[in-house]
Interface confidence: medium
């Protein structure tokens, strides 16, 4: 039979490659079937028999068409300060991300080892750079004519209201106070919120806090021995 209608296993024509979802087995010197996602090669092909595939066992997966002898292990179960954004199935690995308002402060290829709360900028300081999945919030002192009266990981410095008649001038942490006549603003009223970081499984880049940032009071775990949930196992 010509190669384009051949059934696996078959010997490819010289100089040609195997078809989609097939691989060339060096031992058999034949084009053989790959196993579908969620499966692995239980028995490799020979000159007379095709690949025998089997389903991945619990807590293992294959995401691609493959001919691996065993499925990949899903990553460690998520720690107490993470949320599982993708479950471990036969076709996909588990993905853990830091819970909202937290970021990954220490990671390895296996994923995030340590989540920490996003820094909150204190009154008089606003968010200069928002937190991401892998970097902390950077705060900056509010410039003249702007203020922030909140302790927040999302609020930026806002312009002082502009008064026809000024009662109390604003400073870095309080808005101006007007008398009698209606106030006007150079921006819409209300706090300006920056979006929360989008969950992406990116590698860790270490944040470099600037001298003007508010001190971090973040911590990961309670002081004292780790409860079993924090580690991947109990002792």
């Amino acid at each position: 039979l010509p190669a384009q209608v051949a059934f696996t296993p078959y010997a490819p024509e010289p100089g040609s490659t195997c078809r989609l979802r097939e691989y060339y087995d060096q031992t058999a010197q034949m084009c053989c079937s790959k196993c579908s996602p969620g499966q692995h090669a239980k028995v490799f092909c020979t000159k007379t028999s095709d690949t025998v595939c089997d389903s991945c066992e619990d807590s293992t997966y294959t995401q691609l068409w493959n001919w691996v002898p065993e499925c990949l292990s899903c990553g460690s179960r998520c720690s107490s300060d993470q949320v599982e954004t993708q479950a471990c199935t036969r076709e996909q690995n588990r993905i853990c991300t830091c819970r909202p308002g937290w970021y990954c402060a220490l990671s390895k290829q296996e994923g995030c080892r340590l989540c920490a709360p996003l820094r909150k900028c204190r009154p008089g300081f606003g968010v200069a750079r928002p937190g991401t999945e892998t970097s902390d919030v950077v705060c900056k002192a509010c410039a003249p004519g702007t203020f922030s009266d909140t302790t927040s990981s999302t609020d930026v410095c806002r312009p002082h209201r502009i008064c026809s008649i000024l009662a109390i001038p604003g400073n870095a942490s309080t808005d101006a106070v007007c008398t009698s006549t209606s106030p006007t603003r150079s921006m819409a009223p209300g706090a300006v919120h920056l979006p929360q970081p989008v969950s992406t499984r990116s590698q860790h880049t270490q944040p470099t806090p600037e001298p003007s940032t508010a001190p971090s009071t973040s911590f990961l775990l309670p002081m004292g021995p780790s409860p079993p949930a924090e580690g991947s196992t109990g002792d």
Epitope: S73, S79, L106, E110, F219, L220, S226, G231, S232
Partner: antibody
């Protein structure tokens, strides 16, 4: 309870290789790192590297790249370290230790150690 | 690589007294309010044993006479009161970044 059982003492000739084993029990082997640490007689501790058995990913101290090769067998919950091209400088006790992916991020359980003596 | 310098190299303390061991890192081992510094005890002929993790957290099963403190580059292990069973060599170790490194060790003796 978590236990790490290491293989017995090795006497080897210069230029040869040895393969040390570390069998884990009492926890899910694929969930945590296995670290390897060297200690020469009367000396301090030196980190060789670590392996994440779940994926086989390895991390090495540059000093031990080419000297140590870390592997793991999930089916037997055993981690291995092969030391190649042995010299007298490799004579030491080698420890394996578990390091949790989350939480402590420290080596909280250790094997008893394997003594390697390189001598002609 | 982060270099850890322990002092003193050896220490003799009377039973019931306080022992203080210092560990200084060549650069900060802190990240986001966590210090990735740990302390181990090694009795001759035995493997090291984790005493304190992340600077100040007492490992399960370790007596409360052991405590750790410090941040960034300067860390301290305190044993108070010292007992006869505490004769050992003590090591600090950082896990902030690869390669993980250990201090040179402090040998504690009873005088």
């Amino acid at each position: 309870q978590v236990q790490l059982q290491q293989s017995g003492a090795e006497l080897a000739r210069p230029g040869t290789s040895v393969k040390l084993s570390c069998k884990a029990s009492g926890y899910t082997f694929t969930d945590d790192y296995i670290d390897w640490v060297k200690q020469r007689t009367g000396q301090g501790l030196e980190w060789i590297g670590e392996i994440y058995p779940g994926s086989g990913n390895t991390y090495y101290n540059e000093k031990f790249k080419g000297k140590a090769t870390l592997t793991a067998d999930k089916s037997s919950s055993t981690a291995y370290m092969q030391l190649s091209s042995l010299t007298s400088e490799d004579s030491a006790v080698y420890f394996c230790a578990r390091s949790q992916v989350y939480g402590k991020i420290a080596m909280d359980h250790w094997g008893q150690g394997t003594s390697v003596t390189v001598s002609s | 690589d982060i270099v850890l310098t322990q002092s003193p190299a050896s220490l003799a303390v009377s039973l019931g007294q306080r022992a203080t061991i210092s560990c200084r890192a060549s650069e900060s081992v802190d990240n986001s309010g966590n210090s990735f510094m740990h302390w181990y005890q090694q009795i001759p002929g035995q493997p090291p044993k984790l005493l304190i993790y992340r600077a100040s957290n007492l490992e399960s099963g370790i007596p409360a006479r052991f405590s750790g403190s410090g941040a960034r580059t300067d860390f301290t292990l305190t044993i108070d009161p010292v007992g006869a069973v505490d004769v050992a060599t003590y090591y600090c170790q950082q896990s902030k970044e690869d390669p993980y490194t250990f201090g040179g060790g402090t040998k504690l003796e009873i005088e």
